[in-house]
Interface confidence: low
């Protein structure tokens, strides 16, 4: 008499989350009489998945009619697969008795569940940094399976190499998470730059998921200051301008000081944007020279984005001044923390 075989033809089956999985099982003989049961896992802790005779298994249906005479196909279909369904499934033949006795098990079919990674979420630094500094961006994606995944970082289309990536957990799990940190060196031209975290996974059919972050949220471009005197006007008034250029973000306060005393304070608002995303601002101060006996020391003081003030000073010569002075006289710089970025 030929020995009974329990045949599970697929060693492994991979199914996308939400789909149905078909687990095939046939037996080579109708003898001896007795039921077939499906289990997940082996040994004493195995979990009963399907038993034709009793129990309620709403997501499991037999592929062919198991009550049909001479049926030797005990394949099952599990609907609405989730990552929690992953594992090795065994088709087991029992000999009828009181109780039924386990006779033979199939070799097992490993069910792996392909679950898509969540959309990558990119977060940047909590505080802004200036050009030449390095900032870190973090990208996270969760809930994917299998574990194999690729994450790449790009800045303006160029792949970044200073990257550290971890996939958790290290061991077997129903689903996995990835976390990656990229270090980016800022340049002054990065106001319009973007970093992209690109996640490729078998479930995505070649269309990677992308998360983005704008470097405008991470960068501070400090201003360049220049104070110049325009021509003396006929009414003995001197027009002094303070040009504040190439700064980002727009949050900026400018204060004029005459001989150390606050003359006027202004806040930047609704400025036009330069092509590179930075801003320029020009402030004017009219000084009545005839109201002063001595030279006037004018200071343009700029506080940008909560940083320490930057100063540029200019001395207007009062004594023996001619009616016309040369235009666009460059200022002296007394700002100790001036950043000349050209």
């Amino acid at each position: 008499e030929e020995e009974l075989q329990v045949i599970q033809p697929e060693k492994s089956v991979s199914v996308a989350a939400g789909d149905s999985a078909t687990l095939n099982c046939t037996v080579s003989s109708l003898i001896p009489v007795g039921p077939i049961q499906w289990f997940r896992g082996a040994g004493p802790g195995r979990e009963l998945i399907y038993n034709l005779k009793e129990g309620h298994f709403p997501r499991v249906t037999p592929v062919s009619d198991p009550t049909k005479r001479n049926n030797m196909d005990f394949s099952i279909r599990i609907s609405n697969i989730t990552p929690a369904d992953a594992g090795t499934y065994y088709c087991v033949k029992f000999r009828k008795g009181s109780p039924d006795v386990e006779l033979k098990s199939g070799a097992g079919t490993e069910l792996s569940v392909r679950a898509k990674p969540s959309a990558p979420v990119v977060s940047g630094p909590a505080v802004r940094a200036t050009a030449e500094h390095t900032v870190s961006f973090t990208c996270e994606s969760h809930g994917f399976s299998p574990r194999d995944i690729t994450l790449k970082w790009f800045k303006n289309g160029n792949e970044l190499s200073d990257v550290q990536t971890n996939v958790d957990p290290a061991g077997k799990s129903v689903s996995y998470s990835i976390r990656s940190t990229a270090r980016v060196v800022l340049t002054r031209r990065d106001v319009h730059s973007q970093v992209i975290c690109e996640v490729a996974h078998v479930t995505l059919q070649g269309d990677p998921l992308r998360g983005t972050a704008n470097l405008s949220e991470a960068i501070r471009v400090p201003p360049f200051l220049e104070v110049t005197q325009q021509s003396m006007r006929a009414d003995n008034q001197v027009n002094v301008t303070c040009q504040v250029t190439k700064f980002y973000p727009q949050r900026l306060q400018l204060t004029w000081l005459e001989n150390g005393n606050v003359s006027r304070t202004e806040m930047a608002s609704a400025l036009p944007e330069n092509k590179d995303g930075t801003y320029n601002w020009t402030s004017w101060l009219l000084v009545n020279v005839s109201a002063h006996r001595d030279d006037v020391k004018l200071t343009c003081q700029v506080e940008h984005d909560g940083q320490p003030a930057v100063n540029k000073s200019f001395s207007v010569k009062v004594s023996a001044h001619p009616k016309e002075q040369g235009s666009n006289t460059a200022a002296e710089n007394t700002g100790t923390n001036e950043r000349n970025i050209y």
Partner: antibody, heavy 123, light 107 residues
């Protein structure tokens, strides 16, 4: 360093068959799909199809079904292109090219190319 | 099949020139477009994927742009080693198709 190393030039008679090999170096063959591209003398590039290196399933472009067979031997990290019943018009350089993207078992953008294998069919 | 049409078919330029090659798809291919460079007797070299992403090691003078049906490859300042034939390729729909190529020659 990643390389796709193809077998050398072949001179065949019409009606014969040829098998071109493409060995993957520097990465795991089964992690990326492998495409085949034909370039006839003085002509442009023509996609022949690809093989899913994970499952071994080939996909052929129209015009490359029947006489053309893509296969794998993962034990030696090699993909193969076999052409049967060779014709004069099969004379071309055949390239293997890897699909960009880990686990992209699809035709796609190609990041690495083999150096090409010239197959000449002449009586 | 999606037809890919490159223009011009050939062009002459000098070292230092800025050169633009265009590629038009007969149907929308999103950003599933790649660019390759091929020199005589050599295998193609991959330059750009996803319409605008440069591969590692590709000089920054090469840039790609476009989406949908119209795409461009720009070489900002031609170098002697850039004289070659350039191909675009769509990978949005099977069969994958290439443009007929643009031959860039020294003036």
């Amino acid at each position: 360093q990643i390389q796709l190393v193809q077998s050398g030039s072949e001179l065949k008679k019409p009606g014969a068959s040829v098998k071109v090999s493409c060995r993957a170096r520097g990465y795991t063959l089964t992690d990326y799909a492998m495409n085949w591209v034909r370039q006839a003398p003085g002509q442009g590039l023509e996609w022949m199809g690809f093989i899913n290196t994970y499952t071994g399933e080939p996909t052929y472009a129209q015009g490359f079904k029947g006489r053309f067979v893509f296969s794998l031997d993962t034990s030696v990290s090699t993909a193969y292109l076999q052409i049967g019943s060779l014709k004069a018009e099969d004379t071309a350089v055949y390239y293997c090219a890897r699909t960009r993207g880990y686990y992209d078992f699809d035709g796609g953008a190609f990041d690495y190319w083999g150096q090409g294998t010239l197959v000449t069919v002449s009586s | 099949d999606i037809q890919m049409t490159q223009s011009p078919s050939s062009l002459s330029a000098s070292v230092g020139d800025r050169v633009t090659i265009t590629c038009r798809a007969s149907q929308n291919v999103g950003t599933h477009l790649a660019w390759y460079q091929q020199k005589p007797g050599k295998a193609p070299k991959s330059l750009i994927y996803s319409a605008s992403y440069r591969y590692i090691g590709v000089p920054s003078r090469f840039s790609g742009s476009g989406s949908g049906t119209d795409f461009t490859l720009t070489i900002s300042s031609l170098q002697p080693e850039d004289f070659a034939t350039y191909y675009c390729q769509q990978y949005n729909t099977y069969p994958l198709t290439f443009g007929q190529g643009t031959k860039l020659e020294i003036k």
